[in-house]
């Protein structure tokens, strides 16, 4: 080890200056007594090194790079050795930005996996290894007073979401939740959410079915469809409202929305449709009147309206 580089900081803001020093020990006797130390950033030679002999006989070269514009580069100090460059030492330099404040933090409670899933947008690329941690605590009130801390949730590399398992949750009690981003240049924190996991519950959609025609019931009128749905059993006791959407299978028509329907309707006659036409239908639900998230749309049901010509004006109505 004839040479050693030390730098003012191995990680800096992109575009900031960086100062490095390369010292060659005196006992490297095979070297030229007055060696000229050269600097190289990546493959490019860097002029401007100031070289001096120190009192102990070692040689030192100091260089200041006015702007480090590479997010990653190797800085090396070297000597001319015959016709080649002999590298004495090299260091990795990194440049980037401190983490921006994570934004758009949102959470949903998945009752099937029994976990609170939170996601966020990390902000612009920092060009540096940046860790994100979902932090939370339990709170009796509106999160002004902090209760028990909850174990940090650390997402897998590259992911901007994390799941807090049920054992760390208290339903019907507020939690303070925020994201902390950290890298070598700094730390930032998102604004804090204060929420009861049940207020961000996302239900599973009901299963749409065609209504089994009963012998005594009149067949559907032209342009009408008789529907029923089976509620998601695990969400049965949650008051909710639902909405249907439908569109003809052929053509470029957009979805038409029908609702709100109370989940308890369970049956519905949808009218005002084109006769003898195949339709695609879906349903989704949301906890209501308490807060919640809309479920995904249900798997599609495909039904055809009857061909008989309508005899009077049709409209939506509940059974």
């Amino acid at each position: 080890e004839c040479g050693h580089i030390s730098v003012s900081a191995p990680i800096v803001h992109l575009g900031d200056p960086i100062t490095a020093s390369c010292i060659i020990k005196q006992n490297c006797s095979h070297l030229d007594p007055e060696p000229q130390i050269l600097w190289r950033l990546g493959a490019e030679l860097q002029p401007g090194g100031r070289q001096q002999r120190l009192s102990d006989g070692t040689q030192e070269s100091i260089i200041t790079l006015p702007h480090l514009n590479h997010t990653q580069a190797f800085l090396s100090c070297a000597l001319n050795w015959g016709n080649s460059l002999q590298i004495l030492d090299q260091v990795e330099l990194r440049a980037g930005y401190p983490p921006a404040i994570p934004h758009n933090l949102s959470c949903l409670m998945n009752l099937t996996t029994s976990s609170l899933i939170c996601q966020w947008e990390p902000g612009p690329e920092t060009h540096l290894p940046t860790s994100f941690t979902l932090k939370s605590f339990k709170s009796r009130g509106n999160c002004q007073t902090q209760g028990d801390s909850i174990l940090d949730c650390v997402p897998k590399d590259g992911q901007s979401h994390c799941s807090i398992p049920r054992k760390h949750l208290l339903l019907y009690q507020n939690m303070g939740i925020w994201v902390q981003a950290e890298n070598a240049l700094g730390t930032s924190m998102s604004p804090q959410l204060c929420l009861d996991p049940m207020d961000v519950v996302k239900l599973e959609p009901p299963m749409l079915r065609t209504m089994d025609p009963s012998p005594e019931a009149a067949p559907p009128q032209a342009g009408c469809l008789q529907l029923s749905w089976e509620p998601w059993q695990a969400g049965l006791h949650i008051n909710q409202k639902c909405e249907l959407r439908h569109k003809p299978q052929r053509g470029e028509a957009s979805w038409a929305l029908v609702g709100p329907l109370p989940l308890e309707a369970l049956q519905y006659e949808l009218c005002g449709l084109l006769p003898a036409t195949a339709y695609t239908l879906q349903i989704r639900c949301i906890r209501w009147p308490l807060p919640g998230h809309w479920s995904d749309w249900s798997p599609s049901l495909e039904l055809r309206t009857t061909e008989r010509a309508p005899t009077h004006h049709h409209h939506h109505h509940h059974h």
Partner: antibody, heavy 118, light 107 residues
Framework: EVQLLESGGGLVQPGGSLRLSCAAS????????MGWVRQAPGKGLEWVSS????????PYADSVKGRFTISRDNSKNTLYLQMNSLRAEDTAVYYC???????????WGQGTLVTVSS | DIQMTQSPSSLSASVGDRVTITCRAS??????LNWYQQKPGKAPKLLIY???NLQNGVPSRFSGSGSGTDFTLTISSLQPEDFATYYC?????????FGGGTKVEIK
């Protein structure tokens, strides 16, 4: 304070009918599912039936399906259980209870005893 | 229908003991498992809902754990007022079903 008070229990002959009532107070009755749970003497708990907040959904235990009818009157904050074709095995203390959103029972009434015997 | 199997059906313990009661569902019920305490001549009382949430007013010596098919109610240090019968109940799907009960008696 949430309170549930059952009434209407008593002695009835096999094949007879009885109507149980449960008067609720201390909460917005019309927003909650309600249910009936029974307990035969010296036995465990058995769910009988539940009813959704506005009365449109009414699941029943197989053992009472077709004989019992659950209903509610939200204007009177009252839950009912109409019991027909009663059998000896229906003898039990009948509890009315408020259901939580994820299907737990809390609180419970004090219970009313139904005895089916000749 | 989902069957709930509780064990043991009875146990004897002393004040201060740690007591564990288990409940097994015949199929997966996620976290839809609730625990009740019942004393003779009284209505049941909710202790734990959704597997691990302690109901308001219930002492912290009671705790619940588990998910899927296997669940546990633990009383960390048994108190004189805890001698009672304990029931589990699944609320994943109707019919709602209870375990057979576990009677906790004084040794």
């Amino acid at each position: 304070e949430v309170q549930l008070l059952e009434s209407g229990g008593g002695l009835v002959q096999p094949g007879g009918s009885l109507r149980l009532s449960c008067a609720a107070s201390g909460f917005t009755f019309s927003l909650y599912w309600m249910g009936w749970v029974r307990q035969a003497p010296g036995k465990g708990l058995e769910w009988v039936s539940s009813i959704s907040s506005s009365g449109g959904v009414t699941p029943y235990a197989d053992s009472v399906k077709g004989r019992f009818t659950i209903s509610r009157d939200n204007s009177k904050n009252t839950l009912y259980l109409q019991m027909n074709s009663l059998r000896a095995e229906d003898t039990a203390v009948y509890y009315c209870a408020k259901l939580g959103e994820l299907g737990w029972f809390d609180p419970w009434g004090q219970g009313t005893l139904v005895t089916v015997s000749s | 229908d989902i069957q709930m199997t509780q064990s043991p059906s009875s146990l004897s313990a002393s004040v201060g003991d740690r007591v564990t009661i288990t409940c097994r569902a015949s199929q997966g019920i996620s976290s839809y498992l609730n625990w009740y305490q019942q004393k003779p001549g009284k209505a049941p009382k909710l202790l734990i809902y959704y597997a691990s949430n302690l109901q308001n007013g219930v002492p912290s010596r009671f705790s619940g754990s588990g998910s899927g098919t296997d669940f546990t109610l633990t009383i960390s240090s048994l108190q004189p007022e805890d001698f009672a019968t304990y029931y589990c109940q699944q609320s994943y799907s109707t019919p709602l079903t209870f375990g057979g009960g576990t009677k906790v008696e004084i040794k």
